[in-house]
C-alpha cells in the first residue's frame, strides 16, 4: 500500500499525491475506496508506478521524497499520458505555414524580450522541420500566445504560483494550437524565475502535436529545469517525434516556393495556387505572393499578399469574385475570408461549411463565379460543387465528377478564373487551358504564366 | 452519423441515486473527451461534469462535485452519470455532449443528445 | 470566477430583421467564446465556436465576433425557422440565455 501511517503530514501527501495523479496521470479519484487513508485495491499504486516510470524514479509504486519531490516541481500542465489522441490522422497542422499572435504581454520582461523569446522557440522547431512561423498582430492566427492567471477561458486554470507553469492544446480549430502561460510565475529570460524561452520551446511542442517525453533531456519532458540558453538544443528524441509529424527542412524543396524567394515568373514549370479576377484586373496567387495584371497591359507586377490585406495568410488556395457585388472570396484550408471594395470584412475568416460542403471537405482546390447563371463553382479533389449565390445554397446533385462535366479538365485543378463573358481558364500545373463553357470544350492550351508575356 | 442517446431518467426521492447511461455511436468514442450538461425545466443551461478520452481525467461543476461520479466504458461505447444524494435543484434534463477535441478539454461541444428527464421530488 | 452575461435576456423581432445579442464575460477570455441555438423542446445545437467560426452546417446569416471580455452573435437576416434561445459559452460556463421571439 502507498501509505500505512495517517500522520497529518503524510494526509497531506496523501491528498497531494492523489490529486497530481489524477491530473497528469488519469487516476480516478471516484474509484479509491477510502477508509482511515488506507487505500484497499492496487489503483493508487498503478498510477504512482506509471508515474515512476515515465519520469525515471525508483518504481517502488510508495509516494517516497523522491517521487513527491517530482511531484512539487514546477511543470507543464498536460497530462502525461492518454493526452494527445486527436482527431481521426493525428493531431498536426496540415500546413506548413503557421501564424501565431501574442495576445497581452506579461509584464515581467519588456515586450520586445517577449517576442524575442517567443521567436526564438518558434524557431528551434523550424530549424528541424519544413514548418514556417510568422508572427501577426490582429486577426486570427493558428497558435495565440496567452498570458493568464487562475481560470481563464478553459478547463484547466492555473494555480498561482509554482506548480504549473503553461499548458498548451494540440492542433485544431479555436483554442487548438494555443499556449497559455501562468502569469503567477515570474518570466525572465535567464536563470532566474522561469525562463520563457525553455517554456515557450515546450509548449510549442504541444501546439505542434508532440505529447510528453520520458527522456529527460528531452524538452518534451513535462518538467521544468533550465539548461543555458545560448547552448539549448533539442534532443534526439525531441527531433525524432516532431520529424515523424512533419518530416525534416528537406521536405521544404517540396514545397514549390521557400519561405523568402520570390518566383520566377517566367519560371515554365511556375503554377498558381489561385487565381481571380478582381474588377478589370486578374490576381495570380502563388505561396506569400500576389501578381496584378491589368487587363490587356502588358506589365505586371508583384506583391506581398500580406502588404496589401495584412490580415490574410499565405498561400491562398481559391479564390472568386462577384463583380456586381464588388466582393472576392479567398480560401485557405476550412476557411474563408471576404473582400469587399479590396477591404476584408470584419468577422472573417468563416468556415467552408457555411457554404454547405460536407464535414470531409478540408479545403477547395478551385473557385469560380459565373454571373451569367449566378452560380459559383468549388473544385475540391476530382469532383465539384455548384452554389446558388442568390438563393445562398448547393444546387442538388453535387458533387460531380470534373473530367465528366468538363471535358479535357481535370481530374483535379489548381485554379480557375472567369473571364470575356464565355471562358474559364483552368490551371493544371504549369499547364492552363481556355474553356468555352458555351460549347463545353477547350479552345487553347496555353503555359500558366502565358498572361505576363513569358 | 453521430448519434448520442440518454437514458436511465426518472423519477427519484430526495437522497436518492440514479444513473444515467448514454450510448454513442457514428465516431470514434474513445478519442473524444465527453460532457454532461443539464437544463433545469423553463432554466438555462448547466455544465455538469467532463471525462477524458480514456476514462480518466474527469471535472465537476461545483455544484455537483463529491455526489456525482462521471465515468466511461469505451468498450461499450458508453458514457455514464452516477448521481447520488439527490436533491430538488438537481431536477433537469440531462443532456450528453460530444467534445470536439479529443484531448485537454475546450469545453466545445458540436452534438448532443436528445436528453433524458430527472425529477428529484418526494 | 468567469462569469458571462448575456443581454438582452429576451428580444421581439421580424422575419427579416438584423438582430445582434451580446455576451459579456467579466474578464479576458480571448476568443474562447461558443454560440448554441436551442428550440423549444429539443438539444441545444453548435452555432459559433471560437467566436466568430461557423460550425458546418450553419447559415451564412450567422456570424460571430469579437475577443476579450465583449462578443456579439448577428443574424443577418431572419428567418422563420431562427426564432429560438441562443446561449452563449464558455468551457464550463453558459450565458443565462437570449429567447428570440417573433414580433
Known amino acids: 500500500l502507498p501509505l500505512n501511517s495517517s500522520t497529518s503530514l503524510e494526509k497531506n501527501n496523501v491528498l497531494f499525491g492523489e490529486r497530481y495523479l489524477e491530473k497528469f496521470y488519469g487516476l480516478e479519484i471516484n474509484k479509491l475506496p477510502v477508509t482511515k487513508m488506507k487505500y484497499s485495491g492496487n489503483l493508487m499504486k498503478e498510477k504512482i508506478q506509471e508515474m515512476q516510470h515515465f519520469l525515471g524514479l525508483k518504481v517502488t509504486g510508495q509516494l517516497d521524497t523522491s517521487t513527491l519531490e517530482m511531484m512539487h516541481a514546477p511543470r507543464c500542465g498536460v497530462p502525461d499520458v492518454h493526452h494527445f489522441r486527436e482527431m481521426p490522422g493525428g493531431p498536426v497542422w496540415r500546413k506548413h505555414y503557421i501564424t501565431y499572435r501574442i495576445n497581452n504581454y506579461t509584464p515581467d520582461m519588456n515586450r520586445e524580450d517577449v517576442d524575442y523569446a517567443i521567436r526564438k522557440a518558434f524557431q528551434v522547431w523550424s530549424n528541424v522541420t519544413p514548418l514556417k512561423f510568422s508572427k501577426i498582430n490582429t486577426g486570427m492566427a493558428d497558435i495565440l500566445v496567452v498570458f493568464a492567471r487562475g481560470a481563464h477561458g478553459d478547463f484547466h486554470a492555473f494555480d498561482g504560483k509554482g506548480g504549473i507553469l503553461a499548458h498548451a492544446f494540440g492542433p485544431g480549430s479555436g483554442i487548438g494550437g494555443d499556449a497559455h502561460f501562468d502569469e503567477d510565475e515570474f518570466w525572465t529570460t535567464h536563470s532566474g524565475g522561469t525562463n520563457l524561452f525553455l517554456t515557450a520551446v515546450h509548449e510549442i511542442g504541444h501546439s505542434l502535436g508532440l505529447g510528453h517525453s520520458s527522456d529527460p533531456k528531452a524538452v518534451m519532458f513535462p518538467t521544468y529545469k533550465y539548461v543555458d540558453i545560448n547552448t539549448f538544443r533539442l534532443s534526439a528524441d525531441d527531433i525524432r517525434g516532431i520529424q515523424s509529424l512533419y518530416g525534416d527542412p528537406k521536405e521544404n524543396q517540396r514545397l514549390p516556393n521557400p519561405d523568402n524567394s520570390e518566383p520566377a515568373l517566367c519560371d515554365p514549370n511556375l503554377s498558381f495556387d489561385a487565381v481571380t479576377t478582381v474588377g478589370n484586373k486578374i490576381f495570380f496567387f502563388k505561396d506569400r505572393f500576389f501578381w496584378l495584371k491589368v487587363s490587356e497591359r502588358p506589365k505586371t507586377s508583384v506583391n506581398l499578399i500580406s502588404s496589401l490585406w495584412p490580415t490574410l495568410p499565405s498561400g491562398i488556395e481559391a479564390a472568386y469574385e462577384i463583380e456586381a457585388r464588388n466582393q472576392v472570396f479567398l480560401f485557405k484550408d476550412d476557411k474563408y475570408w471576404l473582400i469587399s471594395n479590396l477591404r476584408p470584412e470584419p468577422n472573417y475568416p468563416k468556415s467552408i461549411h457555411s457554404f454547405g460542403f460536407p464535414n470531409f471537405v478540408k479545403k477547395i482546390d478551385a473557385a469560380v463565379f459565373n454571373p451569367r447563371f449566378y452560380r459559383t463553382y468549388f473544385f475540391v479533389d476530382n469532383q465539384y460543387w455548384r452554389y446558388d449565390e442568390r438563393r445562398q445554397m448547393m444546387d442538388p446533385g453535387y458533387p460531380k465528377l470534373i473530367t465528366k462535366n468538363f471535358q479535357g479538365i481535370g481530374p483535379k485543378i489548381d485554379a480557375v478564373f472567369y473571364s470575356k463573358n464565355k471562358y474559364y481558364y483552368f490551371f493544371q500545373g504549369s499547364n492552363q487551358f481556355e474553356y468555352d463553357f458555351l460549347l463545353q470544350r477547350i479552345t487553347k492550351t496555353l503555359k500558366s504564366n502565358s498572361w505576363f508575356g513569358c | 452519423e453521430v448519434q448520442l442517446l440518454e437514458s436511465g431518467g426518472g423519477l427519484v426521492q430526495p437522497g436518492g441515486s440514479l444513473r444515467l447511461s448514454c450510448a454513442a455511436s457514428g465516431f470514434t468514442f474513445s478519442d473524444y473527451n465527453m460532457h454532461w450538461v443539464r437544463q433545469a425545466p423553463g432554466k438555462g443551461l448547466e455544465w455538469v461534469s467532463y471525462i477524458g478520452p480514456s476514462g480518466g481525467y474527469t471535472h465537476y461543476a461545483d455544484s455537483v462535485k463529491g455526489r456525482f461520479t462521471i465515468s466511461r466504458d469505451n468498450s461499450k461505447n458508453t458514457l455514464y452519470l452516477q448521481m447520488n444524494s439527490l436533491r430538488a435543484e438537481d431536477t433537469a434534463v440531462y443532456y450528453c455532449?460530444?467534445?470536439?477535441?479529443?484531448?485537454?478539454?475546450?469545453?466545445?461541444?458540436?452534438?448532443w443528445g436528445r436528453g433524458t428527464l430527472v425529477t428529484v421530488s418526494s | 470566477d468567469i462569469q458571462m452575461t448575456q443581454s438582452p435576456s429576451s428580444l421581439s423581432a421580424s422575419v427579416g430583421d438584423r438582430v445582434t445579442i451580446t455576451c459579456r464575460a467579466n474578464?479576458?477570455?480571448?476568443?474562447?467564446l461558443n454560440w448554441y441555438q436551442q428550440k423549444p423542446g429539443k438539444a441545444p445545437e453548435l452555432l459559433i465556436y471560437?467566436?466568430?467560426s461557423l460550425q458546418s452546417g450553419v447559415p451564412s446569416r450567422f456570424s460571430g465576433s469579437g475577443s476579450g471580455t465583449d462578443f456579439t452573435l448577428t443574424i443577418s437576416s431572419l428567418q422563420p425557422e431562427d426564432f429560438a434561445t441562443y446561449y452563449c459559452q464558455q468551457a464550463g460556463i453558459f450565458g443565462q440565455g437570449t429567447k428570440l421571439e417573433i414580433k
Open positions: 474578464q479576458s477570455i480571448y476568443t474562447y
Open positions: 471560437a467566436a466568430s
Open positions: 455532449a460530444k467534445d470536439i477535441r479529443g484531448a485537454y478539454s475546450s469545453g466545445l461541444f458540436d452534438y
